[in-house]
Interface confidence: medium
């Protein structure tokens, strides 16, 4: 070896200076007597080497690199050899940082493997080989006094976690645990954890299961679910509390939490849910009352709540066929008694013959809001129920009785807007229990089957706003019937429009007779049109050649009119305006000429 490098330190803080010397022995006879020593860091020549001959004839060059900014580089000592640079010796230099204090040390006890897994964040890159060691000792109390050390746990390269196996764990006392980081520039230690491995148990959630229905057990109530859960066996001896969360599968509802719940539940009934709704449920547990970590949420269980029997009031109304009074058309409307009144699957009308205990005869079963059936001759009353898979609503009795109550008076109707009509009346004496209001298209489109109806439960009401099935320009027949305890009063009816249309055209004017100063006109009235209000009056207009206008108002029953005070041998333009409350329309213009003074009158 002709040359040898020595350095002040092969590993330094990044950015620190480093000093190196290179000595070339005298016996390297093939070299120049006064060789010039060069320095190279990586591929770059470094100026600043101070060279001297020592007393023993060797050559020495010393260089100081003021800042080593490479995390790893080779420093070479070289000589010029012919046209090339000859490397006599080289050393590897490394620069970096001492290890930062490892932070966020945390541990979890895995009960399945009975091992303690600890993890930490190693901190910023040191650029140097750095070893981490998980160190621990056993201790009673709060780890102020250190007992025997536990075997060090060394993670695999590059990992920031380590697993202390069961054989090195102490399940019956505390452990002090910390991480030590070490490299060539120093050592650092994390803050110490003092823990009982059981305080950091990672629990697994129980398994949710639906209850197997047993024949003797009552089915769950509407809006309830029966379920149970099987605890995770390795955690059975740990005191825990659990919580359940649930939400409807459909819609945007957020999770609702229920708890605390016991770890073991042979049976649990969750109520207050929406009936007939599919729910997703999950459970999780935490060590309690002592410190711990929540388990993950369990896999979902999907269950459907039972539905509730309909809780509705059924408002009913009926009508007999005029040609066959035993054929009854029954109408009804469900009125919810609660916010969630249950799904209605259908309706049943039935009759219980007197003297036949328990025998119930169905008269009709339908999903519609009406049905027509033949009423048995001895039947005065039928029962109506709404039903679904959970049961039936309370039966609504429908009594078929004669109209024996007093009638209401002064029935009238008026438009509120194009889509509603107000019907008013004077209540009879005594007050009825309520009223049935029916409405539908009046003649010529009237039809009993297409009527809309409503029950007014307030017997003191003096009117009702019809908002359903009202369209403008249609004539409506409105029928109001008072209802009494066991009978009803006679029905009254009235006709009305919610909005009427102006006449579509006025009658054509015809000239019947004409003279020198008069003209007799006539017209045929337009037949009444559905949706158009009756005419209130006509106005006849006439204009002379000098553009002077004259008019006269005629009543709606007029069929003709005589214009007087005309000028002989003069031209007149005449038209008729037909007016109703909804507007007016003009006829076409009739032009005529009065006779000359010497002409004879035309009849």
């Amino acid at each position: 070896e002709c040359g040898h490098i020595s350095v002040s330190a092969p590993i330094v803080h990044l950015g620190d200076p480093i000093t190196a010397s290179c000595i070339i022995k005298q016996n390297c006879s093939h070299l120049d007597p006064e060789p010039q020593i060069l320095w190279r860091l990586g591929a770059e020549l470094q100026p600043g080497g101070r060279q001297q001959r020592l007393s023993d004839g060797t050559q020495e060059s010393i260089i100081t690199l003021p800042h080593l900014n490479h995390t790893q580089a080779f420093l070479s000592c070289c000589l010029n050899w012919g046209n090339s640079l000859q490397i006599l010796d080289q050393v590897e230099l490394r620069a970096g940082y001492p290890p930062a204090i490892p932070h966020n040390l945390s541990c979890l006890m895995n009960l399945t493997t009975s091992s303690l897994i600890c993890q930490w964040e190693p901190g910023p890159e040191t650029h140097l080989p750095t070893s981490f060691t998980l160190k621990s000792f056993k201790s009673r109390g709060n780890c102020q006094t250190q007992g025997d050390s536990i075997l060090d746990c060394v993670p695999k390269d590059g990992q920031s976690h380590c697993c202390i196996p069961r054989k090195h764990l102490l399940l019956y006392q505390n452990m002090g645990i910390w991480v030590q980081a070490e490299n060539a520039l120093g050592t650092s230690m994390s803050p110490q954890l003092c823990l009982d491995p059981m305080d950091v148990v990672k629990l697994e959630p129980p398994m949710l299961r639906t209850m197997d229905p047993s024949p003797e057990a009552a089915p769950p109530q509407a809006g309830c679910l029966q379920l149970c859960w099987e605890p995770w066996q390795p955690g059975l001896h740990i005191n825990q509390k659990c919580e359940l969360r649930h939400k409807p599968q459909r819609g945007e509802a957020s999770w609702a939490l229920v708890g605390p719940l016991p770890l073991e539940a042979l049976q649990y009934e969750l109520c207050g849910l929406l009936p007939a709704t599919a729910y997703t449920l999950q459970i999780r547990c935490i060590r309690w009352p002592l410190p711990g970590h929540w388990s993950d949420w369990s896999p979902s269980l999907e269950l459907r709540t039972t539905e509730r029997a309909p809780t509705v009031r059924l408002d009913t109304w009926w009508r007999q066929r005029q040609l066959d009074p035993r054929t009854v058309q029954l109408f009804w409307k469900p009125v919810p008694l609660e916010e969630d009144s249950g799904r209605i699957q259908g309706y049943v009308v039935s009759w219980r013959p007197s003297g036949q205990a328990g025998a119930i005869l169905p008269l009709c079963n339908t999903t519609e809001l009406s049905c027509t059936f033949h009423l048995p001759s001895e039947a005065q009353e039928v029962a109506l129920v709404a039903y679904n898979s959970a049961g039936t609503s309370r039966p609504t009795p429908v009594v078929f009785s004669e109209s024996r109550g007093p009638a209401l008076t002064r029935l009238h109707a008026m438009a509120r807007d194009p889509h509603s009509l107000w019907v008013g009346w004077e209540p009879p004496n005594p007050w009825p229990q309520g009223y049935v209001i029916e409405w539908g298209l009046g003649p010529p489109s009237a039809s009993n089957s297409n009527k809309t109806w409503r029950m007014e439960q307030n017997g003191r009401a003096t009117g009702f706003l019809l908002k359903e099935n009202i369209r403008p320009f249609q004539l409506y027949e409105i029928i109001v019937t008072p209802l009494y305890q066991d009978t009803m009063g006679p029905s009254q009816h009235v006709y009305a429009y919610s909005q009427e249309m102006a006449p579509s055209h006025a009658p054509e004017l015809h000239l019947k007779h004409i003279g020198k100063t008069w003209a007799q006109l006539e017209w045929v009235p337009e037949p009444p049109e559905l949706g158009k209000s009756p005419l209130t009056h006509y106005t006849i207009f006439w204009t002379n050649a000098q553009n002077q206008s004259f008019s006269a108002i005629l009543n709606a029953s007029s069929r003709g009119f005589v214009l007087h005070g005309l000028e002989p041998a003069s031209l007149y333009h005449i038209h008729l305006m037909a007016a109703s409350q909804a507007g007016a329309t003009n006829s076409t213009v009739l032009t005529l000429m009065t006779l000359t003074p010497e002409g004879s009158e035309l009849h």
Partner: antibody, heavy 118, light 107 residues
Framework: EVQLLESGGGLVQPGGSLRLSCAAS????????MGWVRQAPGKGLEWVSS????????PYADSVKGRFTISRDNSKNTLYLQMNSLRAEDTAVYYC???????????WGQGTLVTVSS | DIQMTQSPSSLSASVGDRVTITCRAS??????LNWYQQKPGKAPKLLIY???NLQNGVPSRFSGSGSGTDFTLTISSLQPEDFATYYC?????????FGGGTKVEIK
Amino acid sequence: EVQLLESGGGLVQPGGSLRLSCAASGFTFSLYWMGWVRQAPGKGLEWVSSISSSGGVTPYADSVKGRFTISRDNSKNTLYLQMNSLRAEDTAVYYCAKLGELGEIREWGQGTLVTVSS
Amino acid sequence: DIQMTQSPSSLSASVGDRVTITCRASQGISSYLNWYQQKPGKAPKLLIYYASNLQNGVPSRFSGSGSGTDFTLTISSLQPEDFATYYCQQSWVYHLPFGGGTKVEIK
């Protein structure tokens, strides 16, 4: 000197309840696991239940799970065993036990006899 | 749960004999095995913990060995006060079952 003194044993009818107590002295009670071990007449030792120093871990033998409850009051240096739904096979001498750091039973009480009979 | 099986259930021996009792765990328990001695009408007493560690005050003629599933309690020279029932117990998991016991009687 460590002392463990059990009390609360006696005669009880099947289906009845009993509460055993163990008063501890001579050591820092709150730092140690404690437990109960029983021995039926003429039979071997049977571990019943243990409780961690803080009270949060309470394993039970399958034969008593759901019927017996172990608890402790560190402020009173006392260990308890609440026994419900007692059966004839629960008849035994019940020992209070102090556990060591490796789960071994370092100290034993003198025992209290529980007899379940109609 | 781990089961502990002791054998023999009883043995007869004379003073001065070497006595060996075995205990087998139904699964590996490392060295977490403890031995107890019980005399009639008395509470048990800890002899050996963690397979081979002699409890303070216990004569050195008692020794323990083994790890994993098979363990042995040896009394090198039986003394009159050693006639008693001996129990093994595991403490690897939180359930702490005992073996069925071995009664050592005078021959």
